[in-house]
């Protein structure tokens, strides 16, 4: 594996070459962690401490801001509860979602008293509206955590908000909620570590199962403590959880609780020299690459090791067909707290728990109509026995010999002369971005990774906590505690002044145009375009 980047650019070099634009934050704000990209309006909305920003995608130096602090009374109450006035007793924005054509929905910690509201953004970009609906505040419980240190994953679809968060002041009652809309809130089971065991939520995504929207599912990605007996000693497991979009809760024991919730472990590991696999269990971020078939996105996951002794990071890819196969497989079962987990061998009730009520897969109209045995089984068997293994059974990127860990990932699919390539932009905990291309070898999923660039995007080392990629603008947007950075997806001119250097770079965005290394456009009818991503061979492509 080529672990040395083709280009390594310091923050100073990035600035000097006009390859980074930074918004270094406001004196009275921080925590620029919550991103919402709006390509149509050409805006990046960012939720931070006491503020929501609307940045111009062309240049983030051009922005509007909304100030949304808490009242002095609320701040004092928070302080009296023993919380830190600067780090906790403020309104840290945790949810920022498109509500409809004219409004966003935003939720914040509200100084340990979660609160939500609507933000008007107008019908058209030229309306230039960006204002808080001051008259309409809502309880943010079950939407945003109380504690700004806690992670939240959320998704707003059809006027309903799905959130994985902590629903209590102490930050111990973790649940996946559905709120807003016209229905009673629905949540995961309380007081049952088999459902959720101190989870850290990463993200939530809507994925279609079939052409029938009744089959749509919401998938949550999170990491959590392994359940006793699942692993010897204390361990973390990465998870994917599913919920049917049309789950309205059950009856009897699952009234207003999910009836279709299932979870499975995500494995990202490499075989060790001693026969013991090295596991990357700490899921940090997830990116879904939708291409051609929206029912089958490729899932990119960024993982780190749990060990303090051995620090490493990896990127694993998963196929949704593998995920679905696991959810159709055996349920995890054990007869008591001191027993091992085994695949459930008994009779699985009909309709199979986890199946969405629809005309496609079964003859029942609502989760409220599920038979008692289905409800009882679903409540007792939320986990699958088999894990989801990555494509090719191994990570596509591994970093173990460095002083940083991966935190974020976004992926761009790029058309090159010799095919399509997935270019990964990986954020780290020291404020650098790695640009990595995965190059297929014999089969498309047997990949070689090439580290193209390592760029420092913030003046001081600071963990990257948010990333968005605009294909329209060909720009990358990066968030951290310190501020927001913007950089182009490609810096072809920096690769050098010769065809060989351009070709050796193996950057799918770039090709030699006869006089310079420049952006490659597949539509351009230029016979002189020299590019070889698969082999990086200048001899066959460069005549100079």
């Amino acid at each position: 594996k080529n672990n040395v980047p083709r280009l390594k650019l310091s923050y100073k070099e990035m600035l000097e070459s006009n390859n980074v634009i930074t918004f270094n934050g406001l004196a009275n704000s921080s925590s620029y962690h919550t991103f919402l990209l709006d390509e149509e309006r050409s805006r990046l909305y960012v939720g931070a401490k006491d503020h929501i920003f609307s940045f111009d995608l062309v240049n983030i130096k051009d922005f509007q801001k909304i100030v949304w602090p808490v009242s002095y009374t609320r701040r004092d109450e928070c302080k009296w509860a023993g919380k830190d006035i600067l780090k906790e007793c403020a309104n840290f924005i945790k949810v920022l979602k498109a509500y409809n054509q004219t409004h966003l929905y935003a939720c914040g910690t509200g100084a340990f008293h979660p609160i939500c509201t609507y933000i008007e953004i107008g019908h058209h970009p030229e309306d230039n509206i960006f204002k808080l609906e001051n008259s309409h505040f809502e309880n943010g419980r079950g939407k945003s955590p109380y504690d700004p240190k806690l992670l939240t994953a959320s998704l707003l679809i059809d006027g309903e908000l799905y959130s994985g968060t902590a629903a209590d002041f102490m930050g111990r009652d973790f649940a996946i909620f559905r709120t807003l809309g016209h229905h009673h809130p629905i949540r995961t089971e309380q007081h049952d570590s088999r459902w959720l065991n101190d989870p850290k939520f990463i993200s939530a995504h809507l994925i279609s199962e079939s052409d029938n929207p009744e089959d749509d599912k919401v998938y949550f990605f999170f990491r959590e403590n392994a359940i006793d007996g699942e692993h010897s000693g204390k361990a973390t497991h990465a998870r994917i959880g599913q919920i049917c979009k049309n789950d309205f809760g059950g009856h009897r024991s699952l009234v207003n609780k999910w009836t279709t919730f299932l979870k499975a472990r995500l494995i990202c590991s490499v075989p060790g020299p001693n026969g013991i696999d090295t596991h990357f269990d700490e899921l940090q971020d997830v990116f879904l690459m939708n291409f051609k078939d929206p029912k089958n996105p490729v899932v990119y996951g960024v993982f780190t090791t749990s060990s303090n002794i051995f620090k490493g990071s990896a990127v694993c890819m998963y196929s949704m067909s593998d995920v679905r196969r696991v959810f159709l497989g055996p349920y995890a079962h054990r007869d008591g707290p001191n027993y091992q987990w085994v695949p459930y061998q008994g009779r699985v009730p009909y309709p199979r728990p986890g199946t969405c009520p629809s005309k496609t897969f079964g003859g029942f109209d609502s989760t409220k109509d599920l038979p008692d045995d289905v409800i009882t089984f679903a409540r007792s068997h939320p986990a699958m026995y088999n894990p989801v293994f990555p494509m090719n059974n191994r990570p596509i990127v591994i970093k173990t010999d460095v002083n940083y860990q991966f935190t974020q990932i976004v992926v761009d699919r790029v058309d090159a002369e010799d095919g399509q390539y997935d270019v990964m932009f990986i954020g780290t905990d020291v404020g650098t971005v790695l640009k990595v291309v995965s190059i297929p070898k014999e089969t498309w999923y047997d990949l070689e990774e090439v580290l193209l660039e390592e760029m420092t995007v913030f003046r001081e080392p600071t963990a990257i906590s948010a990333m968005e990629l605009s294909t329209k603008q060909q720009q990358l947007y990066i968030g951290s505690t310190a501020g927001v950075a913007q950089l182009p997806l490609h810096r072809c001119d920096i690769y050098g002044k010769a065809c060989a250097e351009c070709c050796l770079a193996r950057d799918p965005y770039c090709a030699w145009d006869g006089s310079a290394c420049s952006r490659y456009f597949p539509t351009a009818k230029r016979a002189t375009r020299a590019q070889d991503i698969r082999n990086g061979d200048p001899l066959t492509h460069c005549s100079d």
């Epitope: 209590d168 102490m170 111990r172 309380q190 007081h191």
Partner: antibody
Framework: EVQLLESGGGLVQPGGSLRLSCAAS????????MNWVRQAPGKGLEWVSG????????GYADSVKGRFTISRDNSKNTLYLQMNSLRAEDTAVYYC????????????????WGQGTLVTVSS | QSVLTQPPSVSGAPGQRVTISCTGS?????????VHWYQQLPGTAPKLLIY???NRPSGVPDRFSGSKSGTSASLAITGLQAEDEADYYC???????????FGGGTKLTVLG
């Protein structure tokens, strides 16, 4: 009709033990979280302990932690409270109560109560 | 010392309206948790009167109503009747431990 019937109370010396039982009927006992709440003579209510439907979660008030043990037998529709190292301040009527979770935010309420059983700790 | 504060006693004549307050803190009622109210008639077990701040279980007369604001909640009883003479307790969630907290109770006396 939901019914909760406590038993097992009585007079016990300090340091002694008692085991309270609560027989449930009229509802699907195995589906509900159950609790013990006590009331000292002439005083207010105090939550003592709670247990989830499958015994996966168990909680205790600080005042009884390490001395009391809550358990349930779903096959017998019965809730138990094993009380050890009893003190004079444990003297109270002990109620068995069902968690209702009737509210929007799933915050526990107690929708059904037993009639209580009196525990007196005295030498 | 109860975590939720209630007045020890209130009184009112038949037909009158009385309110009972319940004050908590930012880690219980003020944290957005729901408040429930119980009525305990002399010599009997408590009975759920109001759940989720303002909802009445079936069988509870609409003379009883609940509300919540900030770190406080209140129970209002209109058209006071002799059979309303009882102890009233508020209760809130308080996180995993102590899980739930009660007010100290308020003795309602119906005069006359």
């Amino acid at each position: 009709e939901v019914q909760l019937l406590e038993s097992g109370g009585g007079l016990v010396q300090p340091g002694g033990s008692l085991r309270l039982s609560c027989a449930a009927s009229g509802f699907d006992f195995s589906s509900y979280e159950m609790n013990w709440v006590r009331q000292a003579p002439g005083k207010g209510l105090e939550w003592v302990s709670g247990i989830s439907w499958n015994s996966g979660w168990i909680g205790y008030a600080d005042s009884v932690k390490g001395r009391f043990t809550i358990s349930r037998d779903n096959s017998k529709n019965t809730l138990y409270l094993q009380m050890n190292s009893l003190r004079a301040e444990d003297t109270a009527v002990y109620y068995c109560a069902r968690s209702g979770y009737s509210s929007s935010w799933f915050d526990p309420d107690f929708d059904y109560w037993g009639q209580g059983t009196l525990v007196t700790v005295s030498s | 010392q109860s975590v939720l504060t209630q007045p020890p006693s209130v009184s009112g004549a038949p037909g009158q309206r009385v309110t009972i307050s319940c004050t908590g803190s930012s880690s219980n009622i003020g944290a957005g948790y729901d408040v429930h109210w119980y009525q305990q008639l002399p010599g009997t077990a408590p009975k759920l009167l109001i759940y989720g701040n303002s909802n009445r279980p079936s069988g509870v007369p609409d003379r009883f109503s609940g509300s919540k604001s900030g770190t406080s909640a209140s129970l209002a009883i209109t058209g006071l009747q002799a059979e309303d003479e009882a102890d009233y307790y508020c209760q809130s969630y308080a996180g995993p431990n102590p899980y739930v907290v009660f007010g100290g109770g308020t003795k309602l006396t119906v005069l006359g």
